[in-house]
Amino acid sequence: LSCHFPRRPAYGDVTVTSLHPGGSARFHCATGYQLKGARHLTCLNATQPFWDSKEPVCIAACGGVIRNATTGRIVSPGFPGNYSNNLTCHWLLEAPEGQRLHLHFEKVSLAEDDDRLIIRNGDNVEAPPVYDSYEVEYLPIEGLLSSGKHFFVELSTDSSGAAAGMALRYEAFQQGHCYEPFVKYGNFSSSTPTYPVGTTVEFSCDPGYTLEQGSIIIECVDPHDPQWNETEPACRAVCSGEITDSAGVVLSPNWPEPYGRGQDCIWGVHVEEDKRIMLDIRVLRIGPGDVLTFYDGDDLTARVLGQYSGPRSHFKLFTSMADVTIQFQSDPGTSVLGYQQGFVIHFFEVPRNDTCPELPEIPNGWKSPSQPELVHGTVVTYQCYPGYQVVGSSVLMCQWDLTWSEDLPSCQRVTSCHDPGDVEHSRRLISSPKFPVGATVQYICDQGFVLMGSSILTCHDRQAGSPKWSDRAPKCLLEQLKPCHGLSAPENGARSPEKQLHPAGATIHFSCAPGYVLKGQASIKCVPGHPSHWSDPPPICRAASLDGFYNSRSLDVAKAPAASSTLDAAH
């Protein structure tokens, strides 16, 4: 028994030492978020072990004091979702002694009413502003530098409208050094870790993004007032492009921010000539008036692989050649969708052929394809040798996209017998619930029933083949009840069968000679019981007409009257 795996907080993570009693879970939040709740949970012992406290959450706090600020991030409450109304948040950033601060604007999105972001060059609300969203229309791409060790950040929102708010990155830097660079949706490599004068930094973008503005390589210059010689570049998902990599990503313009209206973008993807392309469409959330089209070739005249509007879940496409053209047209009329609306397409170069990849043999089993060529529609069936069973799907189909419909199965040794089943009018005693080799099942009939067959079945292993029960399941039959006495045939009639004793449940049938009709039941039954008895009195055969009746009488003169029959069973 163990504790459940603790829920990972949004904008945070959890590390677990063990899920068993005594184990612990430690939580931490992404930069800019603060932990609300216990940082450390312990798994307590109980019938059902449980964590000693509720899982914490990571929240973006409204303000705070960050002393010894080296590198980090401050975000508005709710980020990346919208902030709420009527907020006044103050953050004080304080660099270590002798250091200054640099701020990067990762994102600022304020409602157009009276929401305001002010950044002050000092440690209080009276310090002079270096940025005021009321005064400045564009964000300073180079960011902000403090003259001392403090920045004071104010965010205020009014009672109407809301937006994503802000995310600011801060970096402290020493005298004689440049601040740590930052590129959103990208990375950089540096010649030295603390960025003294002479350091060079090279930028690169995440897959799907393109470097814009600024320079790929920047250098920390000027020993008297160290600064980067060029503006840091930006990485952006752009509209259109030609890609010749063997694998990569195509993103909707501006991803994960909303794409613009009225766009017409075209991307060409080209791989090696004898290869083809697999398109893995991982995100597709576009408007109903927007169109994403895939062309199986290097221009818009090629065959259409697929055309999509609106949202759609994860799917894949395969080209028949080494080029694919992707066109995205956004509706000029409708308003744009929100954050993470758009598309994310991963592409990979794959071998070019018209068959699914060869499937391997599996240990302790064999495969049989429906035809020699593994073309679309071919079915491969896996079977196991006696004593083994298929784990997974035994039937794999070559799909239109030339991938197999299921994962490869395996053959696992059968170590148990199948459930021999219940037997009517009995109970069963089971030694092991899953019937492993050596397990026994004992059948006991309910009272009034008798066992026919083996009372105890044992699961035996076999050299070849699956384990087998020692016998078949028994039956529980109703206790043998005493029989009914045989009844005489009616005068001028017959009975079948002609026996002295009839078992409980048996039926006898009566018939009459020609010219006679049966009066009473033609069939009567020996009703089981203590004692058993006939269901009805025996019938009689009556002449069909008076002539017949008198004729029969003349033959019967010398006959003794028939003995009366008992309706009770023998005791």
Epitope: S431, T440, Q442, S455
Partner: antibody, heavy 119, light 106 residues
């Protein structure tokens, strides 16, 4: 003389588990089944299940399948019943009773173990 | 499962009086068993297989019945017979018990 000696009364908290014992003497322990019966004012007597001490085979009343687990220790001629996830509805007197393959009744009974589930 | 209904639920009888109690099954059963339980003690097997008396049970007790109707009879009530009597069937698994008839002495 056949005797079935049960463990003493139990007072437990809701959610906990309890294990009741029944020590048999005066007969061959493996020759008879051990059955368990619950007696409560609301539901009179209810058969919980039984165990064959010779094979360890068990059968349960469907109503108790998730509640009770029957085991035996042949070396000490003792049968056990564990009850889990206890609630106030499990408060009752529990009896062990002997039975045989062809005995469709309960011929000898333990003195009973009173279980009280309360917080 | 088969439901056993005992009647009456409570009855009282004077010493020497003949006493009968019944056990009705919701469907037919082959045999019925009876137990006697006195306050604060465990049940004792009293009558088994419908009509057989357990060892030590006085001959004034008898059992009878078939199908879905069974009865326990005391030919002449005695003070020591005051107890609760339960019927039980095992013609269908799970075995079930009746709700009991409490017999008191007047």
């Amino acid at each position: 003389e056949v005797q079935l000696q049960q463990s003493g009364p139990e007072l437990v908290k809701p959610g906990a588990s309890v294990k009741i014992s029944c020590k048999a003497s005066g007969y061959s322990f493996t020759d008879y089944y051990m059955r368990w019966v619950k007696q409560s004012p609301e539901k009179s007597l209810e058969w919980i299940g039984e165990i064959n001490p010779s094979t360890g085979g068990t059968t349960y009343n469907q109503n108790f399948k998730a509640k009770a687990t029957l085991t035996v220790d042949k070396s000490s001629s003792t049968a056990y019943m564990q009850l889990k996830s206890l609630t106030s509805e499990d408060s009752a007197v529990y009896y062990c009773a002997r039975g045989g393959y062809f005995l469709y009744y309960f011929d000898y009974w333990g003195q009973g173990t009173t279980l009280t589930v309360s917080s | 499962q088969i439901v056993l209904t005992q009647s009456p639920a409570i009855m009282s009888a004077s010493p020497g009086e003949k006493v009968s109690m019944t056990c009705s099954a919701s469907s037919s059963v082959s045999y019925m068993h009876w137990y006697q339980q006195k306050s604060g003690t465990s049940p004792k097997r009293w009558i088994y297989d419908t009509s057989k008396l357990a060892s030590g049970v006085p001959a004034r007790f008898s059992g009878s019945g078939s199908g879905s109707s069974y009865s326990l009879t005391i030919s002449s009530m005695e003070a020591e017979d005051a107890a609760t009597y339960y019927c039980q069937q095992w013609s269908s698994t799970p075995p079930t018990f009746g709700g009991g008839t409490k017999l008191e002495i007047k």
